[in-house]
């Protein structure tokens, strides 16, 4: 049995141990029969052993000194076992460009030091994966960094100074990915107090989908221990874990364009993520960039998406225009943004499912509005849906196969736009097809960048 004596100190230790094992190892306290603090059955003992094994302690099944010391050590609030069992397919971000926002700043540090610590913490993970992180100051970020004390809007209230230092949620919508830091700690840039950088590296690991590690050398080990931040490195276990989710940095080469470089406009292999008209202009989206082509003029200009719309993400995947309403819809993952008169509307992004897509649709490949029918066509993998913009609902009988109804197009497409009252321009890789929707056939085959005089 864990304890035989019933002194008040030991009673307190047992109660503390119970709470710890409930919080971090799933001990079901309601199933513990209690008689004068003596526990019948092995539930408590088994959980103590599980904890000792996970944290590298001598496995005794007793609340011995070293076990109680470990239980009192400052640590992450995320449970050690049965934690990251997420949605089917596993808790990972299904994209390589991830945004974060610092919601509020601890008064313990200069703002610049907080920014720097958080940026460097993200960098630790981007150095060993294909992931790219960018800080945004407004709008909805994938990962929200919050300093809070006590109850703060989730089920996991902080506990004052010491104990739980921080916690984070695995990837997902809403609270998913968010990292919360206990404001009752004293956050620092050094070894005094609690080092924000080291804690943030750990919490961002959770934000990216990692659970706790039982390797004491790993940054994902549950308890906090200061190490020299100038020589800090991820352990082999941390790297193995994160690369099992996202691959190594070389996977970047699979992305058409790494973080900073502007794609070569006349590269014969150039493809686009999304294309749409906006009035008399055509916008071509690629990674963090868009080109602006004014109809019938040879000149084009390249811009950062963030320079025109700071609250929008990079990697727009689909776009369409309803010119009569001066509206442009931009899509990425399962969200969309509405641009009116070239200004982002408030209260966006919204879920693509508000259009009526079934739950299995997680992103849109391409979209185009046809003003003649007042219908929008959404292309998803090898199928397409048709949406009635007047009635604001999907037309019955969809989805249909692209290849069946757009002769010569498909099975999948990257982008499409509507022009000259009768043509769709479909983009597939580095190829483009002019499609006459009245004749229902391809009338020209072009390179994707033919609009730029290449």
């Amino acid at each position: 049995l864990p304890l035989n004596s019933s002194t008040s100190l030991e009673k307190n230790n047992v109660l503390f141990g119970e709470r710890y094992l409930e919080k971090f190892y799933g001990l079901e306290i309601n199933k513990l029969p209690v008689t004068k603090m003596k526990y019948s059955g092995n539930l408590m003992k088994e959980k103590i052993q599980e904890m000792q094994h996970f944290l590298g302690l001598k496995v005794t099944g007793q609340l011995d000194t070293s076990t109680l010391e470990m239980m009192h050590a400052p640590r992450c609030g995320v449970p050690d076992v049965h934690h990251f069992r997420e949605m089917p397919g596993g808790p990972v971000w299904r994209k390589h460009y991830i945004t974060y926002r610092i919601n509020n700043y601890t008064p313990d540090m200069n703002r610049e030091d907080v920014d720097y610590a958080i940026r460097k913490a993200f960098q630790v993970w981007s150095n060993v994966t294909p992931l790219k992180f960018s800080k945004i100051n407004t709008g909805m970020a994938d990962i929200l960094v919050v300093f809070a004390r006590g109850a703060h809007g989730d089920f996991h209230a902080f506990d004052g100074k010491g104990g739980i230092l921080a916690h984070a949620f695995g990837p997902g919508s809403g609270i998913g990915g968010d990292a919360h830091f206990d404001e009752d700690e004293f956050w620092t840039t050094h070894s005094g107090g609690t080092n924000l950088f080291l804690t943030a590296v750990h919490e961002i690991g959770h934000s990216l989908g990692l659970g706790h590690s039982s390797d004491p050398k790993a940054v994902m080990f549950p308890t906090y221990k200061y190490v020299d931040i100038n020589t800090f490195r991820l352990s082999a276990d941390d790297i193995r874990g994160i690369q099992s989710l996202y691959g190594d940095p070389k996977e970047n080469q699979r992305l058409p364009n790494p973080d900073n470089s502007e794609p070569a406009l006349c590269d014969p292999n150039l493809s686009f993520d999304a294309v749409t008209t906006v009035g008399n202009k055509i916008f071509f989206f690629k990674d963090r960039f868009f080109w602006l082509k004014v109809s019938e003029r040879p000149k084009t200009s390249v811009n950062l998406i963030s320079s025109l719309w700071p609250t929008l993400p990079s990697g727009i995947e689909a776009a369409y225009e309803i010119e009569a309403r001066n509206q442009v819809f931009l899509f990425k993952d399962d969200k969309y943004w509405l641009i009116s008169n070239l200004r982002p509307e408030p209260n966006y992004p919204k879920s693509i499912h508000s259009f009526g897509f079934p739950n299995f649709v997680k992103k849109i490949d391409a979209a185009v509005f046809n003003p003649r029918f007042y219908r929008t066509y959404f292309f998803v993998d090898n199928q397409y849906w048709r949406y009635d913009e007047r009635r604001q609902m999907m037309d019955p009988g969809y989805p249909k196969l692209i290849t069946k109804n757009f002769q010569g197009i498909g099975p999948k497409i990257d982008a499409v736009f509507y022009s000259k009252n009768k043509y769709y321009y479909f983009f597939q890789g580095s190829n483009q097809f002019e499609y006459d929707f009245l004749l229902q056939r391809i009338t020209k085959t072009l390179k994707s960048n033919s609009w730029f005089g290449c």
Epitope: L27, H82, F84, R85, G176
Partner: antibody, heavy 122, light 103 residues
Framework: EVQLLESGGGLVQPGGSLRLSCAAS????????MHWVRQAPGKGLEWVSY????????HYADSVKGRFTISRDNSKNTLYLQMNSLRAEDTAVYYC???????????????WGRGTLVTVSS | DIQMTQSPSSLSASVGDRVTITCRAN??????LNWYQQKPGKAPELLIY???SLQSGVPSRFSGSGSGTDFTLTISSLQPEDFATYYC?????FGQGTKLEIK
């Protein structure tokens, strides 16, 4: 299609006990947090309790702490609420609800059952 | 402890009206706010999560906004099926509800 079906409600005397069940189908039950939420007649919603995917990590509202016990049997895809020392103010429709997340609950309920009525009266 | 206050507690409106319901927290809850719709005798249904994200299958006339302590649910053009009670919620705390009735 996700379905949640509560059962076990009924009339019970103050101080008595009742066990509610919620049969789940249409999703991988063992991957998600589950919750109980109640609604007294003509009143608003009140969260009661949640349980983690594996059966550990339980959490209770102060109003039921020490009297109610949430549990689950993943092999049977069933959620339970054992209610002891019942009081008149526990009279309500009890809903079971699925959390949108499978770890570290956010308390975002994407599917609800139809509810089962518990009446505590002498 | 965090508390959620919804206003108004009841509201009369006509089909086609634009309606706004507000929810206030007594401390910051960032964007961790959800909205549910409940019709008489039925279970609640999730409308909006994370303050402004529309749940799958919910019509686009519903929208949410806000962060920190102040949040709003807006129905841009009321439809007959929208007359119901609306609740805001974060973690284990619900607002007291707003009953939307036909004028």
């Amino acid at each position: 299609e996700v379905q949640l079906l509560e059962s076990g409600g009924g009339l019970v005397q103050p101080g008595g006990s009742l066990r509610l069940s919620c049969a789940a189908s249409g999703f991988t039950f063992s991957d998600y947090n589950m919750h109980w939420v109640r609604q007294a007649p003509g009143k608003g919603l009140e969260w009661v309790s949640y349980i983690g995917p594996s059966g550990g990590y339980t959490h209770y509202a102060d109003s039921v702490k020490g009297r109610f016990t949430i549990s689950r049997d993943n092999s049977k895809n069933t959620l339970y609420l054992q209610m002891n020392s019942l009081r008149a103010e526990d009279t309500a429709v009890y809903y079971c609800a699925k959390d949108i997340r499978g770890a570290y609950s956010s308390g975002l309920f994407d599917y609800w059952g139809r509810g089962t009525l518990v009446t505590v009266s002498s | 402890d965090i508390q959620m206050t919804q206003s108004p507690s009841s509201l009369s409106a006509s089909v086609g009206d634009r309606v706004t319901i507000t929810c206030r927290a007594n401390q910051s809850i960032y964007t961790y706010l959800n909205w549910y719709q409940q019709k008489p005798g039925k279970a609640p249904e999730l409308l909006i999560y994370a303050a402004s994200s529309l749940q799958s299958g919910v019509p686009s006339r519903f929208s949410g906004s806000g962060s920190g302590t102040d949040f709003t649910l807006t129905i841009s053009s009321l439809q007959p099926e929208d007359f119901a009670t609306y609740y805001c919620q974060q973690a284990g705390i619900f607002g007291q509800g707003t009953k939307l009735e036909i004028k």
